[in-house]
């Protein structure tokens, strides 16, 4: 038994990473590995992640981890019963995926102007919680071609558009997701997605 | 908001022990590592025990053997206990989160040893 | 035990003058976990800098800390009348612990 692709980590710079790799063969990846892993740390103490099978020879593991920081290093054995398969470590602030943004609201009861909100997915004490921006998908369910991107680069977790740049009468859905520059994350999932019917008055034309 | 709101300071006699208390509120009490640092009068800060997420602990060597630093998840509590208590060992003590450094502190309580 | 030694003892200077402020190790120490605190009287300290250089949040950017292995630095580029108080740097290692030095006092002129 070998890893044929070593142990790929992403931290979600809160409490969970996520480890993927492949063997080069069918594994049955929750009784035959262990993932061990350590915060290097005068106060941590070894923690045991049962793998689960992604496809035939993926396996991937979710780590519990304290609170991270920026200075957080973590050593990761990969074990097949007694024999090391791979040994490695870990710098959650390196790879960094943040959580998907929650909660997202679409007000249509604002004059001709929707309000997106949605919610930070970190706590206040967080490093990331003052740090994302976010991007809102926008796209019609009719028309496959109306499709947009509003880039949020302020701090507030809210979006407002002019009803009237969407087309009146139709159906639409909106989603969001996040990243933070300072650590050169990568995007977020996607948040679920919300719709809502886009209707607004034609201002009246004059002769 | 983070908080950490100490109690259990007092006036003890050499040789007595106290206990001091550390609620947590504000963020996820079980996944961070607890701290105790002091400060004698007039003195600067002295880093006393601590205490990590699965319960390992660590003493400086001033307080090891008297002191024994706990935790309880489930109350977001940390503690110390304090026996054979000494003349030095009167100090404003402070609780902190934190972990290769204390960005979040509690207020202080006295500990006043004095026959 | 790392031994922090601050200098100087007390750093008496005016307002809007540059304070620089100096920690040296008694052996060398990861920048990673140099960090630097201010204290008031009768109150806790407040992280200032941590990882030798990295300002904490909410902390004003007069506030600098530079270094790596034995010597580090904390400098406040324009003394503001609510900086004067007492700064600490302190260490961590992974087989040592923890250490503070024994602060620097800065004070008005």
């Known amino acids: 038994m070998k890893v044929l692709q070593e142990p790929t980590c992403v931290s979600d710079y809160m409490s969970i990473s996520t480890c993927e790799w492949k063997m080069n063969g069918p594994t049955n990846c929750s009784t035959e590995l262990r993932l061990l892993y350590q915060l290097v740390f005068l106060l941590s103490e070894a923690h045991t992640c049962i793998p689960e099978n992604n496809g035939g020879a993926g396996c991937v593991c979710h780590l519990l981890m304290d609170d991270v920081v920026s200075a957080d290093n973590y050593t990761l054995d990969l074990w097949a019963g007694q024999q090391l398969l791979w040994k490695g470590s870990f710098k959650p602030s390196e790879h960094v995926k943040p959580r998907a943004p929650g909660n997202l609201t679409v007000h249509t009861n604002v004059s001709d102007t929707l309000l997106l909100t949605w919610s930070n997915p970190y706590p206040p004490d967080n490093y990331l919680y003052n740090h994302l921006t976010y991007a809102v998908n926008i796209w019609s369910e009719n028309d496959p071609a109306d499709f947009r991107i509003y880039n949020v680069t302020y701090l507030e977790p809210s979006l407002r558009i002019a009803a009237s740049t969407l087309k009146s009468g139709i159906s639409y859905r909106a989603r969001v997701r996040a990243w933070a520059q300072c650590y050169n994350t990568t995007w977020s999932e996607w948040s679920p997605s919300t719709k809502w019917h886009n209707s607004y008055r034609e201002p009246f034309e004059q002769h | 908001e983070v908080q950490l709101v100490q109690s259990g300071g007092g006036l003890v006699h050499p040789g007595g022990s106290l206990r001091l208390s550390c609620a947590g509120s504000?963020?996820?009490?079980?996944?961070?590592?607890m701290f105790w640092v002091r400060q004698a009068p007039g003195k600067g800060l002295e880093w006393v025990s601590g205490?990590?997420?699965?319960?390992?602990?660590n003493y400086a060597d001033s307080v090891k053997g008297r002191f024994t630093i706990s935790r309880d998840n489930a109350k977001n509590s940390l503690y110390l206990q304090m026996n054979s208590l000494r003349a030095e060992d009167m100090a404003v003590y402070y609780c902190a989160r934190g972990r290769y450094y204390f960005p979040w502190w509690g207020q202080g309580t006295l500990v006043t040893v004095s026959s | 035990e790392i031994v922090l030694t601050q200098s100087p003892g007390t750093l008496s200077l005016s307002p809007g003058e540059r304070a620089t402020l100096s920690c040296r190790a008694s052996q060398s120490v990861s920048s990673s976990y140099l960090a630097w605190y201010q204290q008031k009287p009768g109150q806790a300290p407040r992280l200032l800098i941590f990882g030798a250089s990295s300002r904490a949040p909410g902390i004003p950017d007069r506030f600098s800390g530079s270094g790596s292995g034995t010597d580090f630095t904390l400098t406040i580029s324009r003394l503001e009348p609510e900086d004067f108080a007492v700064y600490y740097c302190q260490q961590y290692d992974h087989s040592a612990g923890w250490t503070f030095g024994q602060g620097t006092k800065v004070e008005i002129k």
């Open positions: 205490i990590g997420t699965g319960g390992a602990t």
């Open positions: 504000g963020f996820t009490f079980s996944r961070n590592a």
